[in-house]
């Protein structure tokens, strides 16, 4: 018996067609991905294979201004219009707390929602109760298939999933759930689910009884050959992982943004086995027509973003200086806001011991492209804020030693004075430089903000420590020539859409004055430009 | 909350076909089975089938395979059984139910509806 | 098919008693097992399933457990409201079947 398994994950608010780096689709032509692409690829595979699902491994929501402005009700939407058969939560899914999962997408979604690993309690036990599930059985055919979800235990840590939900370690909370599939004589168990690439090998091995594993979280680009597109493989499609009772277990990923449409073909035995497994991500190209009856849904739904980006968000009374003369050679305030904003979108109080989880940013010069006048009656727009921030990126929380984020300080002013965007704006860090030294050796001072504190204070940076840090996901990808935060990172999640995260925190504070204050000084006389 | 709302009784004639409807309320129809159970007077009780709203997708008790059809409207919410060839045999209360758990117990139950059958 | 034979087919008990009715299965179903309890013209309601789990709002007298092919309902003390027929049902194996009933009397 043969399955057909497509599957996306961390699709992140991609409704329309992108560019082929997952930002705005600037010439049609060359664009990639979008729902309605993906329809058209989808209703393609279903008329001509027999059993078919189409599966998501979670984080559909966040990342563009779709998400912010219909929170999660385009999600239900457009999936329920590509009939997916199943949905695994992931940690974006509690962007917008508890009450933003449940009722634009726990209530509207027409297809099961799934997640073992989160246990309701209190008083959101019996309201949540039924919403999502640990498991589904899925007749597809003659046959029935067993799905489980599950979702990152880091949630609390990179979402606002409350104090009501409790997230179990994946494998204790997903082997009974298998268990119990198997009483029920459902021999064909897939795990659905967004905890990241190293955790859905860690499943494959160790779950008694899964099958196959589909994942999320970390983006992970798998290929069988040639990749079609700029992805380098992480490994093989599917990526074979041999269980610990000795099965070949398939697990597969689909990048991200809607880019691709996973593809995995499973044949199955009488008795449930996997006899072999084999396809690759399909890359939704222009080659790959819009379904002309969902883009005119797009269409009619895109009105409202338009207005939307044009709408006073907050204001400021003071010049927001985000110019490159600024920016790339000294503390600027823009640069200021945008990591006030950046740690205070992380704030999740989870241990009494930590005033919060993270205090420190770091936000590369070069990644803020245009300041905001006040003299426009101090508004601030959505469409200002994409002037400032173009480039459709993510605020990630990542894990680095005190060695690397010294190396990373390093690298911010071993070329000074050449306008190049490597030069860091802070938060919750105190830099001090001195550029008569020479290059590699020129961080005189580095303190950072203490978070296992009551009140907060500067410290001097430890070598050996591990840090979290709020920065872009350019940085973490090394880019600017940041190769040994990529090279040295301990762990790296995806975090929330930069301008979002902006946005929202000028909405919260309705007006705002950043200040140029110190936090990255010159030491000595030397000239600075 | 979950409520099953089934049609009224019917009387029926041998030979005939009665249809049943279910209507489904408080819940996202298309994400749970739809199970059909019937109890014969004085008798216990007998698995009919299940149906899923999600993709239409049917299975049977083998007793009432080729007699028994379930069908859904998703629209409407509703899921239906109707039963072909009927004896006296068949006098009994139908019920739809729903799970909490796929599959694990039948949690949510119509009222029933009893279908007679005489001549 | 899996035949679920239930004991006793009637019980006379008094309020408080503690009560225990059986349910064998004629080959093993694991812990795919229900409980529910039906009242003259009223639906059944689900109280127990896999073999132990209480179903939402079930008072805390009814408790399950068993596995394999032998499986117990106890009512820690009987109230008046508990005077019912209960029957067993496994989901393990097509078609699923269910136990004859046990009809709880006043005594």
């Known amino acids: 018996w043969e399955l057909t398994i497509l599957h996306t994950n961390d699709v992140h608010s991609r409704l329309e067609q992108t560019s082929e780096d997952s930002s705005k689709c600037v010439n049609a032509s060359r664009c990639m991905g979008g729902v309605a692409r993906l329809f058209t690829k989808v209703q393609q595979i279903r008329r001509a294979e027999p059993n078919v699902l189409l599966l998501d491994a979670g984080d559909q929501y966040q990342g563009t201004i779709w998400f912010t402005v219909y929170k999660g009700a385009e999600v239900a939407h457009f999936m329920n219009a590509l009939r997916y058969d199943a949905m695994a939560l992931g940690n974006h899914e509690f962007d917008n707390g508890v009450e933003g999962l449940i009722e634009p997408l726990l209530k509207e979604a027409k297809f099961p929602i799934l997640s073992a690993n989160i246990k309701a309690k209190g008083p959101l036990a019996s309201q949540i109760s039924g919403l999502y599930l640990p498991y589904k059985v899925l007749p597809v055919g003659d046959e029935v298939v067993g799905i489980v979800g599950y979702t990152s235990k880091e949630t609390p840590f990179l979402s606002n999933p409350g104090t009501n939900l409790v997230f179990e370690d994946e494998i204790t909370a997903l082997q009974p759930e298998v268990d119990k599939l198997k009483t029920l004589n459902v021999n064909k168990i897939i795990a659905l689910g967004h905890s990241g690439f190293e955790m859905d090998k860690l499943i494959a091995q160790k779950v008694r009884g899964v099958d196959v594993v589909v994942g999320g979280h970390s983006n992970t680009f798998l290929y069988t050959g040639n990749p079609p597109s700029k992805e380098v493989p992480a490994g093989k499609y599917p990526f074979i992982v041999t269980s610990d009772d000795g099965r070949k277990v398939p697990v597969v990923q689909a990048y991200a943004f809607g880019k691709y449409l996973g593809y995995l073909k499973i044949e199955f035995d009488e008795r449930g086995n996997v006899i072999s497994s084999h396809g690759n991500p399909i890359l939704l190209n222009s080659s790959i027509p819009e379904d002309p009856s969902i883009k005119a849904d797009i269409n009619k739904w895109r009105i409202k973003l338009d207005n939307y980006s044009t709408q006073e968000l907050g204001k400021t009374i003071v010049y927001l200086d985000g110019s490159s003369q600024s920016c790339r050679f000294r503390e600027c305030n823009m640069g200021n806001l945008i990591c006030d904003a950046m740690i205070n979108n992380n704030l999740r109080h989870t241990d009494e011991m930590f005033w919060n989880h993270v205090s420190m940013c770091i936000l590369n010069g070069g990644g803020i492209r245009s300041p905001i006048d006040e003299r426009n009656n101090g508004t601030i727009t959505w469409e200002n804020l994409a002037a400032v921030l173009p480039f459709g990126g993510t605020f990630d929380l990542v894990q680095l030693k005190g060695s690397t984020l010294k190396k990373a300080f390093e690298h911010s002013v071993h070329r000074y004075g050449q306008s190049t965007g490597e030069f860091l704006q802070v938060g919750g860090i105190h830099v001090v430089y001195d550029l008569s030294r020479k290059p590699g050796d020129r961080v005189v001072k580095l303190d950072v903000l203490c978070t296992k504190c009551r009140v907060p204070s500067y410290d001097p940076l430890k070598m050996d420590e591990v840090y979290k840090v709020i920065l872009p996901n350019f940085l973490a990808n090394g880019g600017d020539g940041f190769q040994m935060i990529k090279d040295e990172l301990l762990r790296h999640d995806s975090g929330d859409q930069d301008i979002n995260v902006v946005s929202t925190y000028i909405s919260k504070m309705k007006v705002i004055y950043p200040a140029v204050e110190g936090r990255i000084k010159f030491s000595h006389h030397h000239h600075h430009h | 909350q979950v409520q099953l709302q089934q049609s009224g009784a019917e009387v029926k004639k041998p030979g005939a076909s009665v249809k049943v409807s279910c209507k489904a309320s408080?819940?996202?129809?298309?994400?749970?089975?739809i199970y059909w159970v019937r109890q014969r007077p004085g008798q216990g009780l007998e698995w009919i089938g299940w149906i899923y709203p999600g993709n239409f997708n049917t299975k049977y008790n083998e007793k009432f395979k080729g007699r028994a059809t379930l069908t859904a409207d998703t629209s409407a919410s509703t899921a239906y059984m109707e039963l072909s060839s009927l004896t006296s045999e068949d006098t009994a209360v139908y019920y739809c139910a729903r799970d909490v758990y796929d599959y694990a117990g039948f949690a949510y139950w119509g009222q029933g509806t009893l279908v007679t059958v005489s001549s | 098919d899996i035949q679920m034979t239930q004991s006793p087919s009637f019980l006379s008990a008094s309020v408080g008693d503690r009560v225990t009715i059986t349910c064998k299965a004629s080959q093993g179903v694991a812990t795919a097992v229900a409980w529910y309890q039906q009242k003259p013209g009223k639906s059944p309601k689900l109280l127990i399933y896999?073999?132990?789990t209480r179903h939402t709002g079930v008072p805390s007298r009814f408790s399950g457990s068993g596995s394999g092919t032998e499986f117990t309902l106890t009512i820690s003390s009987l109230q008046p409201e508990d005077f019912a027929t209960y029957f067993c049902?496994?989901?393990?194996?097509?078609?699923?079947?269910f136990g004859q009933g046990t009809k709880v009397e006043i005594k």
């Open positions: 896999w073999a132990s």
């Open positions: 408080g819940y996202t129809f298309t994400r749970y089975y």
């Open positions: 049902q496994q989901y393990s194996s097509y078609p699923w079947t």
